[in-house]
């Protein structure tokens, strides 16, 4: 279960040590530190697991670890979605769940964990190199997409640790704008801090409600990880790409292994490190994706309809209005 | 607003084929999937099969594969289903239903066409 | 496939009333259900999803309810264009699979 950050209760300063004034500017530094404490930087981890029973059976798992609400999860395979990759799934926390040969079942298995169940045979079936991931569409964080393999050594039965694979891709900057917001607060939080230095603390109450979910932690890679396999994009397996089925992926054609996006913003930036050690990687910034590309005037490739991004997955009249209506 | 205009009445032969158009409006056609169902008389509504406007991928219920045929016409934001070989089992009324991401609901339904199947 | 049952076929009620339609799923559909009606002149609109969701434009006196496989629709205050054949719809795999129906009827 995520737990919400919660603004620690303040404490009113003693009568006469300060004028309004005072009380303003000794408020808003604690409400900045909130601010940026809880600001960490989400995550995205993905598992992938063959099953020993069936060979051609894999289950991907994927996981959201951030404060937001997730108003769309995308599962694909070959690479991330957009960038050469086929869409094997849509979960949306209310609107439904979708999924396309040679997936079989989709599901939530926590409000912000999904696992996707992969069958097939001979062609359509995934292989043990085939790359998946996992894009997470969140408010207030924006989206966020890992991917994962199963390691070359892995028996059947076994499954890759959970890999929050960074993923160097930016389709828009529209997130950059909330975080140059909090990158500011937090220098004029340090800034009123030095002015206020003399000044007590203010008081806190503890909190009362749960600790703070699992936040993703910086981290600076190992050599392990750096020696992790390193794949472009554009190196999509065609030893194991689908064969063309009647219930069609969402996009492309047979020759979805070549769909690279036409525009340079969804092109990938470099190599995707896929982990093979089970410590948690930065999490992987891709874009912010609310009103769908609305202020790039384009839309994600392969994506279909336009999705208000709502903040509570479980809000009210959640997905009202006619979707992408003039 | 949404509008999803379906073709006329259509009468036709066993053994014969028809093909009903679905007409978009007020919306990104390229935005919704395009659903099929089926209402037979008396009884309950069908899922045929979806079809994505963007590049005409299709999926369908294992049911009506090899009956129905599902394409679009991007270019006039036109929904077509084409039914073959008609029994008199195919007799009903037919909806085009546009559905959105992540392309399950039927947010916005056509008024239906009616297929009579008779000699 | 997974199965939708609406054991009440036909329903009659007077205007006013406040008017409960069951439909039961034969596995979990994790409150991924819908409701639709087709009303006497054949027209068809999405009602509720994701089991008590209002679609935008539908009055207030719907609402829907139901967890795991047993699902209602509630209708508090029957309206005489609330006459129709309400469905239920399960969207949580393919193929889309829809309830029998349950007709609407006055009193």
């Known amino acids: 279960m995520r737990t919400e950050a919660q603004v620690p209760a303040l404490q009113p300063p003693e009568p006469g040590l300060e004028g309004a004034m005072g009380h303003r500017t000794l408020v808003l530094p604690w409400v900045l530190l909130t601010l940026c404490v809880t600001a960490g930087t989400p995550e995205v981890w993905v598992q992938v697991r063959m099953e020993a029973t069936e060979l051609s059976s894999f289950t991907i798992r994927c996981g959201f670890l951030g404060s937001g609400s997730i108003s769309l999860v995308t599962v694909s395979w070959g690479g991330p979605n957009g960038a050469g990759g086929t869409t094997l799934a849509v979960l949306h926390p209310e609107r439904g769940i979708r999924q396309w040969a040679p997936a079989r079942q989709a599901r939530w298995e926590t409000q912000s964990s999904i696992s996707l169940i992969l069958e097939g045979s001979g062609a359509s079936s995934p292989c043990a190199n085939t790359t998946f991931c996992c894009k997470f569409a969140s408010f207030p964080e924006g989206s966020w997409e890992a991917c994962g393999s199963l390691p070359p050594s892995s028996d059947p039965g076994l499954s890759a640790p959970p890999t929050p694979a960074p993923i160097l891709r930016a389709d828009l900057a529209g997130i950059l704008g909330v975080s140059g917001v909090l990158l500011f607060g937090c220098v004029y939080l340090l800034h009123l801090l030095r002015r206020h230095k003399h000044r007590p603390a203010p008081r806190l109450q503890p909190s009362r409600t749960s600790p703070q979910a699992p936040r993703a932690r910086a981290w600076a890679p190992s050599q392990a990880s750096q020696a992790a396999l390193h794949v472009p994009y554009a190196t999509i397996n065609t030893s194991c790409r689908p064969a063309t089925l009647d219930t069609a992926h969402p996009h492309g054609g047979p020759s979805w292994w070549a769909s690279l996006p036409t525009h340079a913003a969804h092109r990938p930036q470099g190599p995707a490190a896929w982990a093979s050690t089970p410590i948690p990687a930065r999490g992987s910034f891709v874009s912010v994706e609310n009103g769908l590309y609305a202020q790039a005037g384009e839309r994600p490739p392969h994506t279909g309809p336009g999705l208000t991004l709502f903040p509570d997955p479980r809000g009210p009249r959640a997905m009202e209005g006619p979707l992408g209506v003039r | 607003e949404v509008q999803l205009q379906q073709s006329g009445p259509e009468l036709v032969k066993p053994g014969a084929s028809v093909k009903i158009s679905c007409k978009a409006s007020?919306?990104?056609?390229?935005?919704?999937?395009m659903s099929w169902v089926k209402q037979s008389h008396g009884k309950s509504l069908e899922w045929i099969g979806d079809?994505?406007?963007?590049?005409?991928?299709?999926s369908y219920n294992q049911k009506f594969k090899g009956k129905a045929t599902l394409t679009v016409d991007k270019s006039s934001s036109t929904a077509y289903m084409e039914l073959r070989s008609l029994t008199s089992e195919d007799s009903a009324v037919y909806y085009c239903?546009?559905?959105?991401?992540?392309?399950?609901?039927?947010?916005?339904w056509g008024q239906g066409t009616s297929v009579t199947v008779s000699s | 496939d997974i199965q939708m049952t609406q054991t009440t076929s036909s329903l009659s009620a007077s205007l006013g009333d406040r008017v409960t339609i069951s439909c039961r799923a034969s596995?979990?559909?994790?409150?991924?259900l819908n409701w639709y009606l087709r009303k006497p002149d054949g027209t068809v609109k999405l009602l509720i999803y994701?089991?008590?969701r209002l679609h935008s434009g539908v009055p207030s006196r719907f609402s829907g309810s139901g967890s795991g496989t047993d699902y209602s629709l509630t209708i508090s205050n029957l309206e005489q264009e609330d006459i129709a054949t309400y469905f239920c719809?399960?969207?949580?795999?393919?193929?889309?699979?829809f309830g029998g129906g349950t007709k609407l009827e006055i009193k």
């Open positions: 079809v994505n406007p963007n590049n005409g991928d299709t």
């Open positions: 007020g919306y990104t056609f390229t935005d919704y999937y």
């Open positions: 994701y089991s008590s």
């Open positions: 719809q399960q969207g949580n795999t393919l193929p889309r699979t």
């Open positions: 596995q979990d559909i994790s409150n991924y």
């Open positions: 239903a546009a559905s959105g991401l992540p392309y399950v609901l039927m947010d916005y």
